[in-house]
């Protein structure tokens, strides 16, 4: 028996070869002897039943001259899995067709962190092995059900599942979209008074995007978190539902989700969590956003630089007179200089690779008041 593997919804070609390599009489039948199609000597394809009943079955007329009389089955169904008989030259060739199907659980659009289950449907009597490869090259293998927990952004794309049966294989391609923000976390460094822009780009594109979202904010100085804004998303159009009075955030009307805080103030420094619930999806998308605010001030004879917000303990806060060595540098959130000399002072927040934030303050001779550029 020859074995042919097929994929549901696609086409399969069942071989039948003549030893004489020329056109001859042939008939394809089901195992119960019902005739499917054949050629009885006039070079004309004769179907065994009504056209509607047999419109999925065909042969390759162009191959007949070479002694090849394949049975083509289009739009394969799982129930096409059976034995087919080709009769020619007083002999019978049996061809076994096994149709397989690989499907993804419920939906091919899944939230980051959710599980993907790939299920193999196979004909009775078959014992296939299956291996699936993710777009980033991760291999999973097992029985008829394969699961991947904690889907990540890199899992978006075409998954290739290879079904192996009796040394023959058939390949399935399934497009999976992982719904997530492009970044899990971001941090914004701002001087006091500057406008703050928060952007939440999505890592996927879909025709219609509908849902609702909210930004919760935990200010460093506050004892509890607070909802800063809630919004709706309808077909990629953003509409604000509710916004706090302080701060009064503004939100862009189009994607990517974009929030503007009119002024960076110490009382706003902290961490936020933007959640987005999508229509017909269980669970939510999350992006963390952090705000660090710097303030440089001069009061009487004291020049002070402070930062608020979630900073790494490795960050260095420095005060220096322009073009001079730092007067003070500490891995702390506040530094100061007593009796600073006149000139342009710089407050710098830096790490091993760069200056993250800089604020300048002009110290005037002692009889004047300070000027902040």
């Amino acid at each position: 028996k020859t074995l042919v593997l097929g994929k549901e919804g696609e086409s399969a070609e069942l071989p039948c070869e003549s030893s004489q390599k020329k056109i001859t009489v042939f008939t394809w039948k089901f195992s119960d002897q019902r005739k499917i199609l054949g050629q009885h000597g006039k070079g004309v394809l004769i179907r065994g039943g009504s056209p509607s009943q047999f419109d999925r079955f065909d042969s390759k007329k162009g191959a007949w001259e070479k002694g090849s009389f394949p049975l083509i089955i289009n739009k394969l169904k799982m129930e096409d899995s059976q034995t087919y008989i080709c009769e020619l030259e007083n002999r019978k060739e049996e061809v076994e067709l096994w149709v397989f199907k690989v499907t993804a659980n419920s939906d091919t659009h899944l939230l980051q962190g959710q599980s993907l289950t790939l299920t193999l449907e196979s004909p009775p009597g078959s014992s296939p092995s299956v291996q699936c490869r993710s777009p980033r090259g991760k291999n999973i293998q097992g029985g008829k059900t394969l699961s991947v927990s904690q889907l990540e952004l890199q899992d978006s794309g075409t998954w290739t599942c290879t079904v192996l049966q009796n040394q023959k294989k058939v390949e399935f391609k399934i497009d999976i979209v992982v719904l997530a923000f492009q970044k899990a976390s971001s941090i914004v460094y701002k001087k006091e008074g500057e406008q703050v822009e928060f952007s939440f780009p999505l890592a996927f594109t879909v025709e219609k995007l509908t849902g609702s979202g909210e930004l919760w904010w935990q200010a460093e100085r506050a004892s509890s978190s607070k909802s800063w804004i809630t919004f709706d998303l309808k077909n990629k159009e953003v509409s604000v539902k509710r916004v706090t009075q302080d701060p009064k955030l503004q939100m862009g009307k189009k994607l990517p989700l974009h929030l503007t805080l009119p002024q960076a103030l110490p009382q706003y420094a902290g961490s936020g969590n933007l959640t987005l619930a999508l229509e017909a999806k269980t669970g939510k998308l999350h992006q963390e956003v952090n705000l660090v605010v710097m303030r440089a001030t001069q009061l009487q004879k004291n020049l002070t630089c402070e930062v608020w917000g979630p900073t790494s303990p490795k960050l260095m806060l420095s005060l220096k007179l322009e073009n001079k060595e730092a007067k003070v540098s500490k891995r702390e959130k506040a530094v100061w200089v007593l009796n600073p000399e006149a000139g342009m002072w710089q407050c710098l927040l830096s790490d091993s690779g760069q200056v993250l934030l800089e604020s300048n303050i002009k110290v005037l001779p002692t009889w004047s008041t300070p000027v902040q550029p």
């Epitope: 952090n290 790494s312 303990p313 490795k314 730092a326 540098s329 690779g353």
Partner: antibody
Framework: QVQLVESGGGVVQPGRALRLSCAAS????????MHWVRQAPGKGLEWVAI????????YYADSVKGRFTISRDNSKNTLYLQMNSLRAEDTAVYYC???????????????WGKGTTVTVSS | DIQMTQSPSSLSASVGDRVTITCRAS??????LGWYQQKPGKAPKLLIY???NLQSGVPSRFSGSGSGTDFTLTISSLQPEDFATYYC?????????FGQGTKLEIK
């Protein structure tokens, strides 16, 4: 391509000094913090020191504090480790490594040299 | 200083196995942890940074998780080239400190 090449290793007596160099190429050296990491024979990795991109800040492991000095010359794209009062336990392969710092949040050593061997023995 | 305790110190496994290595910090280091792989006579190689971020070019069978004091490196399906020594490194604060290493050997 991005490369770090250590040199200056050798055999030295206890109490003596040695200076290691690390030549950087293929990237903007002055934009990165740089580390020294060592590994004693058959042992694990031990972090030694870091110097910031502009040389303004230096931090050391307790085991080398006061004896080793990390420095850099950005005009020569070179990192140094001055090792004084060497001890037998300083015997190790010394690696230099580049630190990537992103947003003051993500940190990692992505490029390493092949290492230079220092043997402290009488 | 922050101490890093890595376990196990050695581990025997077979190709195709799922392997987990853990690292515990003596104090909260948020997500300031990286994982490095080292083969005999070679320099260490970065695998994962800031707890869960896969370094470019590193196979996706490597993944990291955790937060605070407990962290995990997982290799989903061991390949022959994965037999090496693995180190965690806390880069949350100075001085940086490595775990003592986990030697992954062929069973």
């Amino acid at each position: 391509q991005v490369q770090l090449v250590e040199s200056g290793g050798g055999v030295v007596q206890p109490g003596r000094a040695l200076r290691l160099s690390c030549a950087a190429s293929g990237f903007t050296f002055s934009s990165y913090g740089m580390h020294w990491v060592r590994q004693a024979p058959g042992k694990g990795l031990e972090w030694v020191a870091i110097i910031w991109y502009d040389g303004s800040n230096k931090y050391y492991a307790d085991s080398v504090k006061g004896r080793f000095t990390i420095s850099r010359d950005n005009s020569k794209n070179t990192l140094y480790l001055q090792m004084n009062s060497l001890r037998a336990e300083d015997t190790a392969v010394y690696y230099c490594a580049r630190e990537v710092a992103l947003e003051g949040y993500y940190y990692y050593m992505d490029v390493w040299g092949k290492g230079t061997t220092v043997t402290v023995s009488s | 200083d922050i101490q890093m305790t890595q376990s196990p110190s050695s581990l025997s496994a077979s190709v195709g196995d799922r392997v987990t290595i853990t690292c515990r910090a003596s104090q909260d280091i948020r997500n300031g942890l990286g994982w490095y792989q080292q083969k005999p006579g070679k320099a260490p190689k970065l695998l994962i940074y800031t707890t869960s971020n896969l370094q470019s070019g590193v196979p996706s069978r490597f993944s990291g998780s955790g937060s605070g004091t407990d962290f995990t490196l997982t290799i989903s399906s061991l390949q022959p080239e994965d037999f090496a020594t693995y180190y965690c490194l806390q880069d949350y604060n100075y001085p940086y400190t490595f775990g003592q290493g986990t030697k992954l050997e062929i069973k």
